[in-house]
Interface confidence: low
């Protein structure tokens, strides 16, 4: 299709070498009901077009994205050629920064509903460059935390070195929606709620003698609770003794709740005490079974192929730890009475003999 009729927008992505930041292009097409009103030249500078991304509305048109090669080759379909660029409804998400993202990107509706729509397209000329050393090195992070229930602010990384007074007018978007109430280089939040979490985009215009560019930065905002002041608590096992059948397989599950921590390094392991010996057991990886804003429940199982007489003399200990401290829960196995006959006991003794040999040959693992 002929792209000469597309409205054109110039964007600059000055990426920080410090973080693996993302970048977003919006397809600035008007809403479907305004689709005849397609050429950006007819919009006054104050009429900011409504962005379409991140909405659930069923009647919004999906768009097709292309990249225009600099050598004049035919337009390339983004999805086929660029795996690090994700098309998400009406946005284009760049997962990794780099000057190789520099180029022209074109979007247009997938479904052409009227003759007017043929020329309904937007061409975005994107220039990507690393932040120069001369510019501010201590800019705001592209990942920012807001503490729930407190006041906070979200800073535009490309402008955070400037005072509010000298900052240009900024256009903010949250999850693709225009935030019309704020025009400064930071958004002040009086009280932080979960809904403040999301992807924020800040734009401002930079002009030189030749042309004007939109400088854009993307900020991932996370709402968090304060770091826990508690060590983890073990939810399961509750009882310190467990009735078992000799010769049968057994799984003992350890479940523990860990409070939120900014740097989260949970430790969960099983170890065995046998007389004066103690060693850690190699067990399947721990897995998160429930995660909320305030805490996370993690489970790790110890699996015995067959319970032996020796196991009845051992203590199985689940150990959990966070940065505050650790908690343990011990479990002693107890044979179920009247559960098996003579054959079971002979079988259990045979297993115990094999297990003793295995135990002795692997015993260099003990602490």
């Amino acid at each position: 299709f002929n792209i000469s009729g597309c409205s054109t927008k110039k964007l600059l992505w000055a990426y920080s070498t410090r973080s693996e930041e993302e970048f977003i292009l919006f397809c600035d097409l008007p809403e479907p009901q305004k689709s005849h009103f397609c050429h950006r030249s007819q919009l006054s500078p104050t009429q900011v077009p409504d962005h379409l991304p991140f909405t659930d509305s069923k009647d919004l048109p999906d768009v097709q994205w292309y990249r225009q090669p600099s050598n004049g080759d035919p337009l390339e379909d983004i999805r086929k050629s660029y795996p690090h660029i994700i098309q998400d409804k009406c946005t284009l998400r760049f997962l990794t920064p780099g000057v190789n993202n520099t180029g022209s990107y074109i979007c247009r509706p997938k479904m052409i509903k009227s003759p007017y729509d043929v020329a309904c397209c937007v061409k975005m000329i994107l220039e990507v460059k690393p932040q120069s050393n001369a510019s501010c090195e201590n800019s705001a992070s592209h990942k920012q935390d807001l503490l729930l229930g407190s006041t906070g602010s979200i800073s535009c990384p490309s402008l955070s070195c400037q005072s509010d007074a000298q900052s240009p007018e900024v256009t903010w978007y949250k999850n693709g929606k225009l935030l019309s109430m704020t025009r400064s280089n930071r958004i002040v939040v009086d009280e932080v709620y979960i809904y403040h979490q999301g992807t924020y985009v800040c734009d401002y215009t930079q002009s030189d003698t030749a042309s004007s560019w939109t400088v854009r930065a993307v900020v991932q905002v996370r709402t968090i609770v304060g770091d826990t002041k508690l060590k983890p608590d073990i939810l399961d096992p509750v009882e310190s003794t467990l009735e078992v059948e000799l010769g049968k397989p057994l799984t003992i599950s350890c479940k523990a709740r860990f409070g939120f921590e900014r740097v989260f390094n949970p430790v969960m392991k099983w170890y065995i005490k046998d007389a004066d010996l103690e060693w850690e057991v190699s067990v399947p990886e721990a897995k998160s079974i429930k995660s909320t804003l305030k805490d996370e429940i993690i489970e790790r199982n110890i699996i015995l192929e067959k319970v032996t007489q020796r196991d009845l003399r051992r203590t199985f200990v689940c150990f959990v730890q966070n940065s505050i401290g650790n908690t343990t829960q011990s479990v002693q196995l107890k044979e179920k009475r009247g559960s098996g006959g003579l054959n079971d006991i002979f079988e259990a003794q045979k297993i115990e003999w094999h297990e003793t040999v295995r135990f002795q040959s692997h015993h260099h693992h003990h602490h």
Partner: antibody, heavy 124, light 107 residues
Framework: QVQLQESGPGLVKPSETLSLTCTVS????????WSWIRQPPGKGLEWIGY???????NYNPSLKSRVTISVDTSKNQFSLKLSSVTAADTAVYYC??????????????????WGQGTTVTVSS | AIQLTQSPSSLSASVGDRVTITCRAS??????LAWYQQKPGKAPKLLIY???SLESGVPSRFSGSGSGTDFTLTISSLQPEDFATYYC?????????FGQGTRLEIK
């Protein structure tokens, strides 16, 4: 450009409380974590603790019983109090900003901006 | 607490030399390791974060590598301004800890 400046008395008597303030200029204290670090003469660096602009703190267990870090967002300052000091607390005390790093599938913090440090001597 | 052990504690080298400093963690810390440079009477300066990422404005002769427990800082060609003390720091778990430092002197 964000700059940090430590201030407070350079001499503190044993058993008294050491009080230092770090003033953040050229940027807002909001949305960042802020740490205190110290360095005894001729020795290495020891992390004391951090504070989030909202007041959430985390302290080094070795000093926890004696440390309080507080923040005053209206003044763009955060402060350190260390009680019951002894000669072993003589050190250069630094304040620093912890900046979030989106690293290989994780999210952690490094100290990218530091104050120039202030020397505190504990002596009678 | 995670202990970080740097080696050597001090070394002498000449301008133009290639220098390697190692840092060993007492337990695995993934890539959550940073390197700092400190000159006498000055605050530490961030050089490397995430074990191998170069901080903005730091010369490319500095590089970092490693993951888990063993890490290295390499200066490919020493310059006069590189003579200083270097510290590694882990931010994998609390408390945050630093290595004891490596003093780099002019031979």
């Amino acid at each position: 450009q964000v700059q940090l400046q430590e201030s407070g008395p350079g001499l503190v008597k044993p058993s008294e409380t050491l009080s230092l303030t770090c003033t953040v200029s050229g940027g807002s204290i909001n949305n960042y974590y802020w740490s205190w670090i110290r360095q005894p003469p001729g020795k290495g660096l020891e992390w004391i603790g951090y504070i989030f602009y909202s007041g959430t703190t985390n302290y080094n267990p070795s000093l926890k019983s004696r440390v309080t870090i507080s923040v005053d967002t209206s003044k763009n300052q955060f402060s350190l109090k260390l009680s019951s000091v002894t000669a072993a607390d003589t050190a250069v005390y630094y304040c620093a900003r912890d900046v979030g790093i989106a690293a290989r599938n994780s999210y952690y913090y490094v100290m990218d901006v530091w104050g120039q440090g202030t020397t505190v001597t504990v002596s009678s | 607490a995670i202990q970080l052990t740097q080696s050597p504690s001090s070394l002498s080298a000449s301008v133009g030399d290639r220098v390697t400093i190692t840092c060993r963690a007492s337990q695995g810390i993934s890539s959550a390791l940073a390197w700092y440079q400190q000159k006498p009477g000055k605050a530490p300066k961030l050089l490397i974060y995430d074990a191998s990422s170069l901080e903005s404005g730091v010369p490319s002769r500095f590089s970092g590598s490693g993951s888990g427990t063993d890490f290295t800082l390499t200066i490919s060609s020493l310059q006069p301004e590189d003579f200083a003390t270097y510290y590694c720091q882990q931010f994998n778990s609390y408390p945050i800890t630093f290595g004891q430092g490596t003093r780099l002197e002019i031979k």
